[in-house]
Interface confidence: medium
């Protein structure tokens, strides 16, 4: 629970397939076997129609059939649940595995991968059991597609639910230099390993990754709370030697015009190994992609106890400046800058339309208004719901709710 950021463990609410908060009109598919197995019948635990969505074509070998859910607004999707076909208890069709694709704008689609690059998710073993899949890393998405798989020609059917919460931060993407490798007694890989945008010429752009996944790094950047990952996994880092300018520059794009109160950057400060808090931060603001940067940059010098090796969240006041794009320079104060999380405290400027196509109707199950005073961006819970419990151990563990 970094100040200003969300706690992923609390972002696990059913998003509305089972309880029909997601309307039929927001559920679609590449094809359907019949009207009685149309996309609208794909709600978890529902027995409507013939008890599931079933595609018209075979999913083997092409794996091109998909079920699509439009959440209408950006959400952080932390889990998905799947079931096979009900059919009055007589259904035999289910999907033993599937892939996920997601989009924030309806144009660019990304394939979900786990922390080790695995795309295929284990699905169901029978038609009735619900299998929940913890998504590590989670997806920030408006649209999610399920692509069922099979290892031979056979019928597959699917019922689904998505779990997560509203992405209140409004961050669409960040642009940053590619993270580097620090060589100690072992190599420490400080790359953004879950970034879902593009990488060209040492620059990552158009996506989100580890700096927006809610996972805050440990004091010792070589260690991680994640299981079976490499040294440096939680952090993205850059060496002063590679930046003659003396700073790392990042750009942040948001969903709509916002008044920014603060930026919170979780930084490592293990100075005995070269990691230092930034010496200062300078941010510029603009309202559109082709517009000029507006006004004076906001400058913030960082003080505090230089001998203190704790990782910490640095709060950078942004003075209520209005923008949709921010460009921030983080000044080196030592050999390395290591960040594990960046988040923003902001309020949507009234009457600003979303950057993404179409209008986003207000989600009625979310309390309106600004974030609560403790700045937890994503902890507003849908009324009357309990979050799905986090399984102990592996962050991508599957468990059954039969």
């Amino acid at each position: 629970d970094m100040k200003g950021h969300f706690d992923p463990a609390k972002c696990r609410y059913a998003l509305g397939m089972q309880d029909r908060t997601i309307p039929d009109s927001d559920i679609s598919a590449s094809s359907s076997w019949s009207d009685s197995t149309a996309a609208r019948h794909s709600r978890l635990e529902s027995s409507d129609g013939d008890g599931a969505w079933c595609p018209a074509g075979s999913v083997f070998p092409k794996e091109e059939e998909y079920l699509q859910v439009d959440l209408q607004r950006l959400h952080l999707v932390a889990l998905v649940g799947t079931q096979g076909r009900h059919a009055g208890g007589l259904g035999k069709e289910f999907s033993r595995s599937y892939r996920l694709r997601y989009s924030r704008d309806g144009r660019r689609w990304m394939g979900w991968k786990d922390r080790w690059g695995q795309e295929v998710i284990s699905g169901n073993e029978d038609p009735e059991g619900v299998v929940l899949k913890d998504l590590g890393p989670p997806m920030v998405a408006r649209l999610v597609r399920f692509y069922p798989r099979a290892d031979r020609v056979m019928s597959v059917c699917l019922r689904v639910e998505l779990y997560g919460c509203l992405w209140r931060d409004g961050l669409l993407s960040y642009t940053a230099p590619v993270g580097q490798t620090m060589y100690l007694s072992e190599a420490v890989y400080l790359n953004d390993s879950t970034y879902d945008g593009h990488t060209v010429g040492g620059l990552q752009y158009g996506g989100l990754g580890q700096l927006a996944d809610g996972v805050v790094g440990l004091d010792d950047f070589r260690k991680s709370q994640e299981l079976r990952v490499w040294p440096g996994y939680d952090y993205v880092g850059w060496s002063n030697h590679s930046f003659s300018s003396g700073y790392v520059e990042m750009e942040f794009e948001f969903d709509r015009l916002r008044a920014f109160q603060a930026m919170q950057v979780h930084c490592n400060n293990m100075h005995t190994l070269g990691a230092r808090l930034p010496g200062g931060v300078e941010c510029r603001f603009r309202r559109g992609p082709a517009m000029a940067w507006e006004g004076e940059p906001m400058r913030h010098n960082l003080g505090g106890n230089l001998g203190d090796p704790r990782a910490r969240a640095v709060s950078v006041p942004l003075g209520g400046r209005v923008a949709r794009f921010l460009q921030c320079r983080f000044l080196f104060a030592g050999p390395w800058l290591l960040f594990s999380e960046i988040s923003f405290i902001s309020d949507v400027v009234n009457n600003s339309s979303p950057a993404l196509g179409g209008t986003f109707p207000p989600a009625p199950w979310w309390p309106p208004g600004p974030p609560p005073t403790n700045f937890s961006s994503l902890e507003l819970e849908p009324r009357g719901q309990q979050p799905v419990a986090k399984a102990e151990g592996s962050p991508t563990i599957e468990f059954r709710m039969d």
Partner: antibody, heavy 117, light 107 residues
Framework: QVQLKESGPGLVAPSQSLSITCTVS????????IHWVRQPPGKGLEWLVV???????TYNSALKSRLSISKDNSKSQVFLKMNSLQTDDTAIYYC???????????WGQGTSVTVSS | SIVMTQTPKFLLVSAGDRVTITCKAS??????VVWYQQKPGQSPKLLIY???SRYTGVPDRFTGSGYGTDFTFTISTVQAEDLAVYFC?????????FGGGTKLEIR
């Protein structure tokens, strides 16, 4: 579960030195930092010193000349030594840890130290 | 060293009341302020860190806010078990100084 337990002599004569041990369980001293804080009877809290996970230290400058902190990671123990005690050093001495939160999230139950002849 | 001036020193309230405690730092401490609760005969317990983030398991009636030099701690609806002394602490620069404490007593 996480536990910290202080052990000390209870009574110390004026001008003598004090040695207190903090024994921890449920976490490793190589990943967490240990602070010492004291509280005179009926009064507030005073931060004394911290030993960071890597073994480096930061002292309260007002007391630095009298304090010494060390640790044994393998035994999960942290040691505080304070010299030249006076009656106004009478207090409950707590050890507390900080980890990934920038705050002291677990405290020991404290050990009472009385400086008296 | 940074001085944390905490007010008031004493509060006498009834169950159900709203309580506000303030802490003023002698210089800016960003939002590196922590609030602790110490019940009689017990060691302090962490309630709020980073000025406004509630620690795991802390009831949501406890909230904190502030940035720079002025910080506020609020109990929205006091309950009998909230009888305790509350301390602020700056965690910005060593020595990590505490406020003098606020003793909350229930009528």
């Amino acid at each position: 579960q996480v536990q910290l337990k202080e052990s000390g002599p209870g009574l110390v004569a004026p001008s003598q030195s004090l040695s207190i041990t903090c024994t921890v369980s449920g976490f490793s001293l190589t990943s967490y930092h240990i602070h010492w804080v004291r509280q005179p009877p009926g009064k507030g809290l005073e931060w004394l010193v911290v030993i960071w996970s890597d073994g480096s230290t930061t002292y309260n400058s007002a007391l630095k000349s009298r304090l010494s902190i060390s640790k044994d990671n393998s035994k999960s123990q942290v040691f505080l030594k304070m010299n030249s005690l006076q009656t106004d050093d009478t207090a409950i001495y707590y050890c507390a840890r900080t980890g990934n939160f920038y705050a002291m999230d677990y405290w020991g139950q404290g050990t009472s130290v009385t400086v008296s002849s | 060293s940074i001085v944390m001036t905490q007010t008031p020193k004493f509060l006498l309230v009834s169950a159900g009341d709203r309580v506000t405690i303030t802490c003023k730092a002698s210089q800016s401490v960003s939002n590196d302020v922590v609030w602790y609760q110490q019940k009689p005969g017990q060691s302090p317990k962490l309630l709020i860190y980073y000025a406004s983030s509630r620690y795991t398991g802390v009831p949501d009636r406890f909230t904190g806010s502030g940035y720079g030099t002025d910080f506020t701690f609020t109990i929205s609806t006091v309950q009998a078990e909230d009888l305790a002394v509350y301390f602020c602490q700056q965690d910005y620069s060593s020595p990590y100084t505490f406020g003098g404490g606020t003793k909350l007593e229930i009528r």
